[in-house]
Interface confidence: low
């Protein structure tokens, strides 16, 4: 670009408003009025002390996904749309977003969008579209704590019946085994476990970096409980937001690190 | 304006460590990376390493990684270079270098000069 | 590592006249994804930091002259200045930012007859 200081034409950051339910994917498109030889496009979430915290990157024909992989920043096309989505939206996703541009090299242009605000709400039980409301029985707030206390004993009933089947089926059950998952089983996922999204990099030629992974946790015997607590995520640093899906795996390097791998 | 404003000029005897502070203005100093780089008396250019001011992650030239320790404070917008085990071969001007995107050193520091002089 | 090798070590020329700078890499700087290559030119005069001149190999840095301009692929890399003025007198580095370690060519000190 050997001229890249004519003034920046204006970004765009769309919808002004979104407003998505927890675990949906929440969308914005950010636009380039045109498109510059270099750039980076990074997005940002405006933190509650006004500060921009970069979400991801995108600059020329790579993708920097940032630290949480639940960002994905996507090229449309046309070459001036960009998709910026927060997969599986978190009700803590709530907040100010924006986009940036930055001409390369200096004179560094540097523009930031419009903000744009996202709500993130609760993800409601009921199907959205409801009959005609039924004639009023219990009030909601009732009803839900009727429903909950029957769900509780119900439960309870349940575990205990299964402790009895249990205890009747392997009266000379081992006390104090420990069995623990081995390493190159993976780990199974009920309904409510948290998925796992991929960042489709399309036919982008990356070179993996491994971060360390965390040492499998010793197993504690004489324990009838077991909780298996994941912290898939790195520490965030001062002032960032924490994330419990930043995923501490391999990480494709930054756009910035030339082909070679990172570290040597 | 993008401006990289370095400490000021240090002798340090053989054996000691020096820090090397820049003070970034200008950009969201968060969004890239902050590279050192060293031009010694008769030699070029030699490449430390650089640091993220985003998390702190490090890349060092092997030949300085055990001697170099990047780190960066974003509160003052700060990056600095610490050489430890200092010795003759170590005199030179440090610069501090932002890579805007890709790794060409776009903006520089001033320089600092270290000596080393017992 | 990569090594830079450039060549010659220094030149002299007079106004008005073009020079060229060489710089070899120990190994292809060309990326194949995205058909880029990985080098970077610097211009340091005397007493002051270090200039971006080039970078991609041939895109000029915003507000360099035209008289300077980057050319080669893979291993072989050429700066070339035209129409040589007075102020152009320091030393030029070329760059691989191809992989870590980055690395510069020992210099090529240029001065003005």
């Known amino acids: 670009l050997d001229s890249p200081d004519r003034p920046w034409s204006p970004l765009t950051f769309s919808p002004a408003q979104l407003t998505v339910q927890e675990g949906e994917n929440a969308t914005f498109t950010c636009s380039l009025a045109d498109i510059p030889d270099s750039f980076v496009l990074n997005w940002y979430r405006l933190s509650p002390r006004n500060q921009t915290d970069k979400l991801a990157a995108f600059q020329e024909d790579r993708i920097e996904p940032g630290r949480d992989r639940r960002f994905r920043v996507t090229r449309l096309p046309n070459g001036r749309d960009f998709h910026m989505s927060i997969v599986a939206a978190r009700l803590n996703d709530s907040g100010i977003y924006l986009c940036g541009a930055i001409y390369l090299p200096p004179n560094t242009q540097i523009n930031e969008s419009p903000r744009a605000e996202l709500s993130v709400t609760e993800r409601t039980l009921e199907p959205p579209t409801q009959s005609p409301s039924p004639p009023p029985r219990l009030s909601g707030q009732l009803q839900g704590l009727v429903i909950g206390v029957t769900s509780v004993l119900v439960g309870v009933l349940l575990l205990l019946l299964l402790t009895w089947v249990l205890a009747a089926v392997f009266p000379r059950a081992t006390r104090g085994a420990c069995v623990c998952g081995s390493e190159d089983e993976p780990l199974k996922e009920g309904p409510d476990a948290a998925p796992v999204f991929t960042l489709d990099y399309g036919e982008l030629d990356f070179q993996w970096r491994e971060k360390t992974p965390e040492p499998p946790a010793p197993c504690a015997p004489e324990q009838t409980e077991y909780a298996t607590i994941v912290f898939p995520g790195r520490p965030a640093s001062p002032g960032r937001r924490a994330s419990a899906s930043s995923l501490q795996g391999a990480q494709p390097p930054s756009p910035e690190d030339g082909p070679g791998l990172w570290p040597l | 304006e993008v401006q990289l404003v370095q400490s000021g000029a240090e002798v340090k005897k053989p054996g000691a460590s020096v820090k090397v502070s820049c003070k970034a203005s200008?950009?969201?100093?968060?969004s890239f990376w902050m590279n050192w780089v060293r031009l010694a008396p008769g030699a070029g250019l030699e490449w430390?390493?650089?640091?993220?001011?985003?998390?702190?992650?490090?890349h060092y030239n092997q030949k300085f990684k055990d001697r170099a320790i990047l780190t960066v404070d974003t509160s003052t917008s700060t990056a600095y270079m610490e050489l430890s085990s200092l010795r003759a071969g170590d005199i030179a001007v440090y610069y501090c270098?932002?890579?805007?995107?890709?790794?060409?050193?776009?903006?520089w520091g001033q320089g600092t000069l270290v000596t080393v002089s017992a | 590592e990569i090594v830079m090798t450039q060549s010659p070590g220094s030149l002299a020329g007079s106004a008005g006249e073009s020079v060229s700078i060489n710089c070899k890499s120990s190994?292809?700087?060309?990326?194949?994804?995205?058909?880029?290559?990985?080098l970077a030119w610097y211009q340091q005069k005397p007493g002051e930091s270090p200039k971006l001149l080039i970078y991609w190999a041939s895109t000029r840095e915003s507000g360099v002259p035209d008289r300077f301009s980057g050319s080669g692929s893979g291993t072989d890399f050429t700066l070339t200045i035209n129409n040589l003025q007075a102020e152009d007198v320091g030393v030029y580095y070329c760059q691989q930012y191809y992989s870590n370690p980055y690395t510069f060519g020992q210099g090529t000190k240029l001065e003005i007859k």
């Open positions: 430390i390493g650089r640091v993220d001011p985003y998390d702190s992650e490090t």
């Open positions: 270098a932002t890579q805007f995107g890709f790794s060409w050193l776009a903006y």
């Open positions: 190994q292809s700087l060309l990326y194949s994804s995205n058909q880029k290559n990985y």
């Open positions: 200008g950009y969201t100093f968060t």
